[in-house]
């Protein structure tokens, strides 16, 4: 799924020349260099459809295109997650899936896309102008969220022209947090390289077990910061609010996974084709600051609400992701 980056293995320096500390400072630049080179800007997409068979049943599909590895997906409705939205489902690549009414079936379609079917009846059922949002937490990009609504005509097999204003945002977690670290790392890397300029260069040799790494062009966090300051994302006011499910929100940390049966479908159940794509293992937790970086959604002419910038009220959030890359 990802392209590979050949990271050269460093030949250890001669004993006594640099010592263990020197070796560590030589390895670190290569790790930083890999991260500097591989940071990209993910694309997140959302698709909302009404089922032909059950007109009050919705299917939400979301996908993530990026170089990092997905550590968590949160699907919400009624607005962005953390800005008035209510969590419908949380999908973790290893720990499985949790969902709350009216979500009927959440599943991984592929390693980078998910789908969620919503029950159509009852007080908490969605209506046509409900906003659905998908938030992907990934390493090293951070958290990225996109939102969408049902298109005006949503018969399967036909797509209508757009009227809903889409929402696309990314948490500063991924921009000022991780990217800030990367920027600092890149500066530090340059500093180290300058320091090592007058020393004998280590011999490089191709690694026989080169780790896989994504390859997307790095981009300047400062650009993102500027965008964050100037570009709010569009919000869609919905007259149809979901039933209050706030008690179901998994804000208490990862412990809520404990109640999840081990068989709870973190591998897609069903078509055999899905069984052949196991989700890779993930590493340890990376804690990041959860500010908000907003990207503008398109606002249809003469329609829709004003543009509003929501801060995320929940403060810092733990985000799981590997310290290495897939």
């Amino acid at each position: 799924m990802r392209t590979e980056a050949q990271v050269p293995a460093l030949q250890p320096p001669e004993p006594g020349l640099e010592g263990a500390m020197g070796h560590r400072t030589l390895v670190l630049p290569w790790v930083l260099l890999t991260l500097c080179v591989t940071a990209g800007t993910p694309e997140v997409w959302v698709q909302v459809r009404m089922e032909a068979t059950e007109l009050s049943s919705f299917t939400i599909r979301c996908g993530f295109l990026g170089s990092g590895s997905i550590s968590l997906v949160t699907v919400s409705w009624g607005g962005p997650n953390g800005a008035g939205g209510t969590t419908l489902a949380v999908l973790h690549p290893e720990r499985g899936i949790r969902q709350w009414a009216p979500a009927r079936q959440a599943r991984w379609e592929t390693q980078s896309s998910i789908s969620l079917i919503l029950e159509g009846s009852g007080a908490s059922s969605p209506c046509a102008n409900t906003t659905f949002c998908c938030k992907f937490a990934s390493f090293p990009e951070g958290s990225w969220e996109a939102c969408g609504s049902l298109p005006p005509s949503s018969d399967p097999g036909l797509s209508a022209p757009p009227t809903p204003a889409p929402i696309l945002r990314a948490d500063l977690a991924g921009i000022l947090g991780v990217s800030g670290v990367l920027l600092f790392g890149c500066v530090y890397l340059l500093h180290l390289l300058r320091r090592h300029k007058h020393r004998p260069a280590p011999r490089l040799q191709p690694s026989r077990t080169s780790p896989q790494a994504p390859r997307a062009r790095a981009w300047a966090p400062s650009q993102a910061s500027q965008a964050a300051l100037h570009v709010p994302y569009a919000t869609i006011n919905t007259s149809c609010r979901p039933a209050t499910l706030d008690t179901a929100h998994p804000h208490g940390g990862p412990s809520w996974w404990a109640s999840l049966p081990t068989h709870a479908a973190h591998r897609p159940q069903g078509p055999a084709a899905w069984a052949s794509t196991p989700i890779p293992a993930r590493g340890s937790f990376v804690s990041v600051e959860n500010g908000l970086y907003a990207q503008a959604g398109e606002r249809p002419p003469h329609t829709g609400p004003g543009l509003t910038l929501f801060p995320d009220p929940r403060g810092p959030r733990a985000m799981e992701g590997p310290l290495g890359v897939r």
């Epitope: 799924m1 990802r2 392209t3 990209g40 800007t41 694309e43 997409w45 959302v46 698709q47 909302v48 599909r61 996908g63 295109l65 990026g66 170089s67 379609e109 592929t110 390693q111 980078s112 896309s113 996109a146 969408g148 298109p151 399967p156 097999g157 797509s159 757009p162 809903p164 204003a165 889409p166 696309l168 994504p214 997307a216 062009r217 981009w219 300047a220 650009q223 993102a224 500027q226 965008a227 570009v231 084709a273 899905w274 052949s276 794509t277 990207q295 503008a296 959604g297 398109e298 606002r299």
Partner: antibody, heavy 120, light 107 residues
């Protein structure tokens, strides 16, 4: 209406570089990912990369990473692709395309393409 | 990279016939597939996305199906204006990749 305007042809010499343009109109340029696709004569389509005009964030196909550089000018709603160290292998039609941002993922509008000829 | 294979480079059919263009992905892409039509001298045009959703304005004789690794674009009641190249494309992961194309020829 939505339009992506590209120059019809570019003729350059081997070893030179060129900057292809794609002027967008009829929609909010900053909120749509812009993609670039190459098509060699009689061949299929190859994805080069994409750029998000709002912040300049981009992704590249590894194959084109040293060949292409994507940029945008928000003030003129124009996406650019700079191609360097050109050889006859780079002769092709280069398309820019807009990715829909409200309903799944697809290219709903394409430019007419710029035919790049690299010849001495 | 995910390889999208369109095994039939050329297909010949007659007006009024039904024809199926196939596309196989090298790994599971779910339903993250689009189909484009490219007429001679023109840029590609979207026909189908999400494997089976017909884009606005596309005639209903074009239908898409499949999921996982195998996808089909079916054109029923083929018209002379359907003479074109047809490309599948996956958008499950970067780099985005296209099939090699199938040229539909009208007898």
């Amino acid at each position: 209406q939505v339009q992506l305007q590209q120059p019809g042809t570019e003729l350059v010499k081997p070893g030179a570089s060129v900057k292809l343009s794609c002027k967008a109109s009829g929609f909010t340029f900053t909120t749509h990912w812009m993609h670039w696709v190459r098509q060699r004569p009689g061949q299929g389509l190859e994805w080069i990369g994409n750029i998000y005009p709002s912040n300049g964030g981009s992704n590249y196909n590894e194959k084109f990473k040293t060949k292409a550089t994507l940029t945008v000018d928000r003030s003129s709603s124009t996406a650019y692709m700079h191609l360097s160290s050109l050889t006859s292998e780079d002769s092709a039609v280069y398309y820019c395309a807009r990715r829909v941002n409200w309903d799944g993922y697809y290219f709903d509008y394409w430019g007419q393409g710029t035919t790049l000829t690299v010849s001495s | 990279d995910i390889v999208m294979t369109q095994s039939q480079k050329f297909m010949s059919t007659s007006v009024g016939d039904r024809v199926s263009v196939t596309c196989k992905a090298s790994q599971n892409v779910g339903t993250n597939v689009a189909w484009y039509q490219q007429k001679p001298g023109q840029s590609p045009k979207l026909l189908i996305y999400s494997a089976s959703y017909r884009y606005s304005g596309v005639p209903d004789r074009f239908t898409g199906s499949g999921s996982g690794t195998d996808f089909t674009l079916t054109i029923s009641n083929v018209q002379s204006e359907d003479l074109a190249d047809y490309f599948c494309q996956q958008y499950n992961s970067y780099p985005l990749t296209f099939g090699g194309g199938t040229k539909l020829e009208i007898k």
